[in-house]
């Protein structure tokens, strides 16, 4: 922490300007008034303060705004944003997409995924929902950031906005997030023809239930293996060999490459070996011929 000293009269700061780069940390602490700093935040990012000097300026703002910075300050944080922790950002109320854009630009190239995720969360809360303008801003300035939102926040996405989401925006989404987004995508694309529908829905299929995957297998979609590997394990396990063959079409040969990886490995273990043999891929690990499978979970549910 910076030691408290009194400011010599000749060092008193009446405006935030470039000469402050020469102020030692203790001089900044003593001579820069927090209210002046907040009022002239728009000047701060034009001044190449060292990161240690920025620590001092942050400390001053923290003291002035213990409950969180106002958006007028947040908008102009610039490189000072790099000093913020997720805990700091959680105190903010952000509604302006211009503020979001400015801070996303600053964070580029820095390891700030937790801070950015928290910032986006605050924007969604501040705006009330994840509207089209917000999604457009995220896809333009922070590809992949959509997936930093919690499933609860993603549930506020109206289906009408889903069309603005690009495949690469979903690359880092986990199963719980896709569980939320998939039904919205299904609704958004429901009036499209078979092939067009599949192209649109494909990035969201990690959230699809078994019945929808089964339905796709009847539509000659020739699902690529990368998409198949992202399907929920629970959605893949009930599929028959014939259904998987129809679903993948010419891509079925890729199962051999993924034989040891989930969900393919788990699916193989549930299939009869003689059914697997019909694929002619040499897949091993299915249920040997002549064995009877008892699903005890069903019996327990009945008793």
């Amino acid at each position: 922490d910076v030691e408290r000293t009194t400011c010599p009269p000749e060092k008193e700061v009446h405006e935030i300007d470039e000469s402050l780069i020469f102020y030692k940390k203790r001089e900044l602490e003593a001579c820069v008034d927090a209210a002046l700093l907040a009022a002239q935040m728009d000047r701060v990012d034009a001044i190449p303060f060292t990161y240690e000097q920025l620590d001092v300026l942050k400390h001053k703002l923290d003291e002035l705004y213990p409950q969180g910075y106002p958006e007028s300050v947040i908008r102009h944080l610039g490189h000072l944003f790099l000093k913020m922790s997720p805990e700091d950002i959680r105190k903010w109320n952000v509604t302006s997409l211009e503020t979001l854009k400015a801070l996303l630009k600053v964070s580029k190239g820095h390891e700030m995924s937790a801070q950015v995720a928290t910032l986006i969360d605050r924007v969604v809360v501040g705006r009330g929902q994840l509207d089209k303008d917000t999604v457009d801003t995220l896809t333009a300035f922070c590809p992949g950031c959509l997936c930093s939102l919690s499933p609860e926040r993603l549930s506020s996405v109206p289906p009408s906005v889903i069309g603005a989401v690009r495949p690469q925006d979903l690359d880092t989404c986990g199963p719980r997030q896709l569980d939320v987004l998939y039904p919205k995508a299904r609704l958004a694309f429901q009036n499209m023809s078979g092939s067009e529908y599949f192209v649109k829905i494909r990035p969201f299929l990690g959230g699809a239930p078994t019945e929808d995957v089964k339905a796709l297998s009847q539509q000659n979609v020739s699902m690529d293996l990368a998409t198949f590997m992202k399907l929920r394990r629970e959605a893949v396990l009930p599929l028959t060999v014939a259904e998987v063959q129809k679903l993948l079409g010419p891509h079925v040969e890729g199962l051999k490459v993924e034989e040891q990886h989930s969900p393919v490995r788990d699916w193989i273990l549930k299939q009869r070996q003689d059914d697997l043999d019909t694929l002619g891929l040499g897949l091993q690990g299915g249920i040997p011929n002549g064995y009877l499978i008892l699903d005890l979970s069903v019996r327990e549910a009945l008793s």
Epitope: I21, F22, T50, E52, L54
Partner: nanobody, 127 residues
Framework: EVQVVESGGGLVQAGASLRLSCASS????????MAWFRQAPGKERELVAG???????YYSDSVKGRFTISRDNAKNTVYLQMDSLKFEDTAVYFC?????????????????????WGQGTQVTVSS
């Protein structure tokens, strides 16, 4: 690559004046900061005066009111006018230029911030 060359040092009586010059070459854009540091025997290098790319100045407490830093853009030269010299001003004076793109260091008063340095010029003030 920026080259920095100081001149103007010498031996003077206490109370006299000297003007140090720092000629820089090697690029057309002004560095973010030009500064004069000094180092007395057995002591750390300390900032004497600094000048930003916009012309703002800064002086250490020990020289404020006696020293003036200025620049002649046409000649790519920074000056340090030293008046009312004291015995304590005796040191090797260094000119430094820096951009500090990584924003390292505690402040621009720290010598670690500057990428380009001259060889230094000796100033000796006799009492």
């Amino acid at each position: 690559e920026v080259q920095v060359v100081e001149s103007g040092g010498g031996l003077v009586q206490a109370g006299a004046s000297l003007r140090l010059s720092c000629a820089s070459s090697g690029r057309t854009i002004s560095p973010i900061a030009m500064a004069w540091f000094r180092q007395a025997p057995g002591k750390e290098r300390e900032l004497v005066a600094g000048l930003t790319w916009t012309g703002r100045t800064y002086y250490s407490d020990s020289v404020k009111g006696r020293f003036t830093i200025s620049r002649d853009n046409a000649k790519n030269t920074v000056y340090l006018q030293m008046d009312s010299l004291k015995f304590e001003d005796t040191a090797v004076y260094f000119c430094a230029a820096g951009d500090n793109p990584d924003r390292r260091g505690s402040s621009w008063s720290s010598s670690s911030v500057y990428e380009y340095w001259g060889q230094g010029t000796q100033v000796t003030v006799s009492s």
